[in-house]
């Protein structure tokens, strides 16, 4: 079939990078400066991609390929192929539509990204609170309490873990 | 084409006015939040402002406060950015952006940018 095919369509023949030009008898031209197509027997190019704004572009765009894009520092790449920058925020922050914001209380987020997560709820493992959490870091869990020697004291285990939420404004 | 084209950047002197605008075209411009970006020379970009929908919410990065009102005319499929009191550390590239298909629902990426107005504020 595909023998048939090419023999019947020249369209089928033209390469990556050209299209079947329809105003021309169904010559193979190439893409015209700005666009691209990344197969054969295609009769149009597709238009390239422009990194713009906080886009930055990664890869030019080629006759045969189309251009990349990541985001400039202070953004990061959201979606497939980076459709989308979505702004960084600090590490013990969160984004929302308000801008970043703190994380709540027994809340952390070690990224730039993301939402807090609750703190580890130490005591549900049996074991007890080695290193308090902060909104950067979660709580390190140690030995549980019936495994610490007599007469050594551990920190006092937080609140029990709440839904990750935003600081009140 | 989906298209951003921003303008009214200049220069200005420290504590005067200055008023941008984003036109949009080639989508349905009430149906998205649109955005404020800025990039100051040598500098990491910086969210400054954004408004959803209908204009009935609108939000700003804590250095424009007070000082920045931004607003949207959905007849005119257009934004605006009112700066007032310019201070030197405002200069920067200015950019309209689009608030994406699920923005406010944990994500609050932008997939349609202008190529930027450039504000500069200096005596």
């Known amino acids: 079939f595909e023998r048939t095919r090419s023999l019947q369509d020249p369209c089928s023949n033209c390469p990556a990078g050209t299209f079947c030009d329809n105003n021309r008898n169904q010559i193979c031209s190439p893409c015209p400066p700005n666009s691209f197509s990344s197969a054969g027997g295609q009769r149009t190019c597709d238009i390239c991609r422009q990194c713009k704004g906080v886009f930055r572009t990664r890869k030019e765009c080629s006759s045969t390929s189309n251009a990349e894009c990541d985001c400039t520092p202070g953004f990061h790449c959201l979606g497939a192929g980076c459709s989308m920058c979505e702004q960084d925020c600090k590490q013990g922050q969160e984004l929302t539509k308000k801008g970043c914001k703190d994380c709540c209380f027994g809340t952390f987020n070690d990224q730039k990204r993301g939402i807090c997560r609750p703190w580890t709820n130490c005591s549900l493992d049996g074991k007890s609170v080695l290193v308090n959490g902060t909104k950067e870091r979660d709580v390190v869990c140690g030995p549980s309490p019936a495994d610490l020697s007599p007469g050594a004291s551990s920190v006092t285990p937080p609140a029990p873990a709440r839904e990750p939420g935003h600081s009140p404004q | 084409e989906v298209q951003l084209v921003e303008s009214g950047g200049g220069l200005v002197q420290p504590g005067g006015s200055l008023s941008l605008s984003c036109a949009a075209s080639?989508?349905?411009?009430?149906?998205?939040?649109m955005n404020w970006v800025r990039q100051a020379p040598g500098k990491e970009a910086e969210w400054v402002a954004n408004i959803n929908q209908d204009g009935s919410e609108k939000y700003y990065v804590d250095s424009v406060k007070g000082r920045f009102t931004i607003s949207r005319d959905n007849a005119k499929n257009s934004l605006f950015l009112q700066m007032n009191s310019l201070r030197a550390e405002d200069t920067a590239v200015y950019y309209c952006?689009?608030?994406?298909?699920?923005?406010?629902?944990?994500?609050?990426?932008?997939?349609?940018w202008g190529q930027g107005t450039t504000v500069t504020v200096s005596s």
């Open positions: 080639g989508f349905t411009f009430r149906s998205f939040w």
């Open positions: 952006a689009r608030g994406g298909p699920d923005y406010g629902d944990l994500h609050y990426g932008m997939d349609v």
